[in-house]
């Protein structure tokens, strides 16, 4: 009889331990859910507020068709210019057409006048080929007008309405480009 009572007591204790464990798991799960909910709400809030304020381009960027452009107010060497653009989620300007070139040079005339601006074009040291930063070749009408007499790496820049070349280590303004946000309306 005593053994039976002892067995029942042990079973009850085991059940109690299991229930405590289940409660602990539930509490942990609830805490995890609350945390996830908090992140989710923050994320939604972030998305909604940025969507609410969303114009196709960020402040101080210029829009043309599907692109946004940023004209820098600081000088830097070509490589640092690229990094400055990446910091903003953009790359150095990649000119795809005569129309885009005309828009850029027209905008620069209005904003700043005749300065030098790095674009995402560089000359391969071995082959001498000009390539955009994504590896594509410029169209024939968009090749730098003069070949730089530099032994160092050579990069492309825009000045007035021309595409020219220079030692990548010289300091110039630069132009960044990113895609414009599509309106969902």
């Amino acid at each position: 009889k005593l053994l039976q009572v002892s067995t029942i007591a042990m079973q009850q204790q085991e059940k109690l331990i299991q229930q405590e464990r289940a409660l602990l798991n539930f509490t942990e799960w609830k805490r995890s859910c609350a945390l996830q909910m908090k992140y989710c709400q923050a994320f939604m809030q972030n998305s909604l507020s940025s969507a609410h304020n969303s114009s196709p381009c960020p402040n101080n960027w210029i829009q043309n068709r599907e692109s946004c452009y940023y004209v820098s107010e600081i000088w830097s060497i070509w490589h640092t210019s690229q990094e400055n653009c990446l910091k903003e989620g953009s790359t150095l300007l990649q000119i795809e057409s005569k129309e885009e070139m005309d828009f850029i040079t027209g905008s620069l005339r209005k904003i700043k006048g005749s300065y030098d601006y790095w674009v995402g074009l560089s000359q391969d040291g071995h082959s001498g080929r000009w390539l955009w930063q994504d590896g594509s070749s410029p169209s024939p009408g968009l090749l730098p007008a003069e070949r730089s007499q530099s032994a160092n790496q050579v990069c492309g820049y825009v000045k007035s309405n021309s595409l020219l070349s220079s030692n990548c280590s010289t300091w110039k303004y630069f132009i960044c480009e990113k895609y414009a946000l599509r309106s969902s309306v």
Partner: nanobody, 117 residues
Framework: QVQLQESGGGLVQTGESLSLSCAVA?????????MGWYRQAPEKQRELVAA???????AYADSAKHRFTISKESARNTVHLHMSSLKPEDTAVYYC??????????WGQGTQVTVSS
């Protein structure tokens, strides 16, 4: 706390291929602007190899064009670098990096890539 974990480095022969991956882990939600890979060879400066922006624009160093391919998995905050036709001069420590919306740049610990001739 943002952590970047690289993987995939190793020793290969000239002409072979190698793929590097980098996973971004964060205790909070972060808005990534761009992701990329730098490398640093002994006695040399760290240089940008390839980068990809949030909207998919690409930037490669001249030495990486037509040999290396950068790609990302936005949902998993992961960036990959596939390197083909490797040369001894590609030997370096490769570092993953991200640029985030608040202007910060974060770095991984680096993974060694050695190309033997």
């Amino acid at each position: 706390q943002v952590q970047l974990q690289e993987s995939g480095g190793g020793l290969v022969q000239t002409g072979e291929s190698l793929s590097l991956s980098c996973a971004v882990a964060s205790g909070s939600i972060i808005s990534i602007n761009s992701m990329g890979w730098y490398r640093q060879a002994p006695e040399k400066q760290r240089e940008l190899v390839a980068a990809i922006t949030v909207d998919g624009r690409l930037a490669y160093a001249d030495s990486a064009k037509h040999r290396f391919t950068i790609s990302k998995e936005s949902a998993r905050n992961t960036v990959h670098l596939h390197m083909s036709s490797l040369k001894p001069e590609d030997t370096a420590v490769y570092y993953c990096t991200i640029w985030v919306r608040d202007g910060q740049q974060y770095w991984g610990q680096g993974t060694q890539v050695t190309v033997s001739s």
